[in-house]
């Protein structure tokens, strides 16, 4: 589904949300670092309802959540976080 959002710059996200998403609605979070033709970092939230949301990396809630997840990184994460580049 996400492949539809490829642009000539190979970015996946054309629209980003800053709205808080509770963890119980989240399946996993994908972090796409800058590079591979996309000039910005992208965060993609895969929700349990099978929909996908691109989150503004500057959104306060996602920064706060990532900080919490970083602190817990030594234990099992309640929300899987995948950091990988697009091949």
């Amino acid at each position: 589904v996400l492949e539809v959002y490829y642009t000539s710059l190979r970015c996946r996200c054309v629209q980003e949300s800053s709205v808080f998403i509770p963890r119980r609605f989240i399946d996993r979070i994908q972090i796409l670092p800058r590079g591979n033709g996309c000039p910005r970092k992208e965060i993609i939230v895969w929700k349990k309802n099978k929909s996908i949301v691109c989150v503004d990396p500057q959104a306060e809630w996602i920064q706060r959540m990532m900080e919490v997840l970083r602190k817990r990184s030594s234990s099992t994460l309640p929300v899987p976080v995948f950091k990988r580049k697009i091949p």
Epitope: V19, F20, I21, P22, R24, F25, K48, R64
Partner: antibody
Amino acid sequence: EVQLVESGGGLVQPGGSLRLSCAASGIDFSRYWMSWVRQAPGKGLEWVAEINPESSTINYAPSLKDRFTISRDNAKNSLYLQMNSLRAEDTAVYYCARQDDYETYTMDYWGQGTTVTVSS
Amino acid sequence: DIQMTQSPSSLSASVGDRVTITCKVSQDVNTGVAWYQQKPGKAPKLLIYSASYRYTGVPSRFSGSGSGTDFTFTISSLQPEDIATYYCQQYYSTPLTFGGGTKLEIK
């Protein structure tokens, strides 16, 4: 237009049971989480329970989980709350609400409520 | 459970006044807070979600702010139709919890 209509309230004796219903229209009911929220006379709002579209995830207020059961029938666009061993403190207006997990991630549509009175 | 302490529990203000309600949360809820308006005999109506986002159709005089444990709801210029009880609610995690409410009256 989204409509949530609760029914099934009434007068019941302590220790009795009641089953509330919420009929939904104007929404794709089978896509949404749903909740029950109650409000005792002159008091604030108290969340009761929620259920996901597939009925595979259900969460309750800890103080109510042993006596109340939330369920749904997507084919009938209906939400239910089975209340057992009712007590005087369960007297309240019971609201059903749609829990949006697409945009707001909270309860964006509410019914008008049905009144439950527990008294001897 | 996450406790929501809302203040004041009641307040009286004049038309045109700026009104502020606060909600203190017992633990960090990120920006997972909503604000509702409830008029007597009616169901609550969603006004603000994600701490600061106005719900569809909500007038711009209503606003919200905050994150973590401290949240604020503001009516920039009170109108007669704003007379109601206002509730904060956290939806960061279950059990979902509400503040005790703030009953707003016109002077």
